[in-house]
Structures are given as C-alpha cells and as structure tokens.
Interface confidence: medium
C-alpha cells in the first residue's frame, strides 16, 4: 500500500516565499513519520524536512540552505518556504514515509508543484537628465 | 501538583451521545496542549484527539473523526471531548492527558481516567 500525495500544480512566490500543502490520503495523527519536500525532476535536493514521533516537539529543518518552516495538519504538511531566489524556480515533490506504527509506508511519487520565484522588482530612483548638449 | 479530573463517562445506548469534561490544576492550562485517549478491554491505549494551547489546531484518530469533538475552555481549565454517533467499539476508559509535545502520542501527565461503555 502506497499513500497518496495531492499538490497544487503550481505557485507563484510573488515576495520571494510560498506555502507548499502537501495532502497525504493518511492520517498522521499518532504516527512517526518523515514529511520532505524535494526539488528538481530527479528529486535530487532535499529542501525541507518534517519529522514528528511521539517523544519529541515537532522538528523542521533544511540541510541544503533553504529557509523553510513546516506545519502539521490531520492529513497535511505545509511547507513554508522563504528567502527563494529565482533560480531557484523549478518542480517541487513532496515525500512522506510513516516509520510507525508498522507496517514502514512511503507515498506514489506525485506530479509536483512548478515554484515560480518572481524576484522582488525594486523601484528605480528616478533618473534626471544631465544638461542637454549643443 | 498536576491533577487531570475526568468526568461525564456512563452507560450509552448505540446511536446515543456524551460529554466527557476533564477539570486541570497544578500547571498553566492554557499553554498547555491537551489530548484524549482510550483504552478498551484488553487493547492497548489508542490516541483519540489532541488540542492545541489556544484552541486553533485540533487532531482526530481516524476511528472517531467527524462524530467526536474536542474542544477547551482556558478560563474554567477544562478539556472536553462531545462523543456523538457512539458506537460499541467506542467502549472503553477514557484519559484526559497533558501532551507537551504537539499532536502526536507524547504525554507527560494523565488522569485516571472515566468509563464509558456503549451497549443496548
């Protein structure tokens, strides 16, 4: 048995951040489990991590540098993400493995979610005109 | 001393309702996130529902979600637990229990607990 994962295809990170929802068909109360988020098509980065188990508070954590914060829901993760440069547009996955109770189950991958950095575009100062010449 | 007080568990026909209170003393209830439990007849404890400190995030087991509510009143320190639609395999004793560490299974005190049997 494979968990199901739902995401919105795509999200545009207007002020350099996105909340990603990754919806699981799993119930995550009382369970331990792993929730990642992974970026690219090869899945090659792992951007954020989830990880909940029954003697600890809730730990979020980025190996790779990226800024990101979690939140659990019944059936959900949501991955706030800050601090994204436009480079960093690319394919989203989202990844969930249940360590306990047994039996060990991990999700079908999904379609992934396009993260679309728009940079912020800052004003330019107004540009006045040297002296015209002859 | 920390003291969780369950009480509202009785006899209930299938079909039937109740409310379970827990009064809490001995700590800050509310900062504190809360949950339910239950332990039926030769099972082991079995999660039920968890609350946060301040209400905003609740958490059901799949066996009871959409005819159980939980819910908190922070000015009484009560917990409460609205069974609805209950079932015989809801019988069981149910714990009032202190969860420091978020909606998972973590507990750090619990009540004695308050008996709630369903049966025709």
């Known amino acids: 048995n494979k968990i199901l994962v739902k995401q919105s295809p795509m999200l545009v990170a207007y002020d350099n951040a996105v909340n990603l929802s990754c919806k699981y068909s799993y119930n995550l109360f009382s369970r331990e489990f792993r929730a990642s988020l992974h970026k690219g098509l090869d899945s090659a980065v792992e951007v954020c991590v989830v990880y909940g188990n029954y003697s600890q508070q809730l730990q979020v954590y980025s190996k790779t540098g990226f800024n990101c914060d979690g939140k659990l829901g019944n059936e959900s993760v949501t991955f706030y993400l800050q601090n994204l440069y436009v480079n960093q547009t690319d394919i989203y996955f989202c990844k969930i493995e249940v360590m306990y109770p047994p039996p060990y189950l991990d999700n079908e991958k999904s379609n992934g979610t396009i993260i679309h950095v728009k940079g912020k575009h800052l004003c330019p100062s107004p540009l006045f005109p040297g002296p015209s010449k002859p | 001393e920390v003291q969780l007080l369950e009480s509202g568990g009785g006899l209930v026909q299938p079909g039937g309702s109740l409310r379970l209170s827990c009064a809490a003393s001995?700590?800050?209830?509310?900062?504190?996130?809360m949950s339910w439990a239950r332990q039926a007849p030769g099972k082991g404890l079995e999660w039920v529902s968890w609350?946060?400190?301040?209400?905003?995030?609740?958490f059901y087991a799949d066996s009871v979600k959409g005819r159980f509510t939980i819910s908190r009143d922070n000015s009484k320190n009560t917990l409460y637990l609205q069974m609805n639609s209950l079932r015989a395999e809801d019988t069981a004793v149910y714990y009032c229990?202190?969860?420091?560490?978020?909606?998972?299974?973590?507990?750090?005190?619990r009540g004695q607990g308050t008996l709630v049997t369903v049966s025709s």
């Open positions: 229990a202190k969860s420091p560490f978020g909606p998972l299974y973590g507990f750090d005190y």
């Open positions: 609350i946060e400190s301040h209400g905003g995030q609740t």
């Open positions: 001995g700590f800050t209830f509310d900062s504190a996130n």
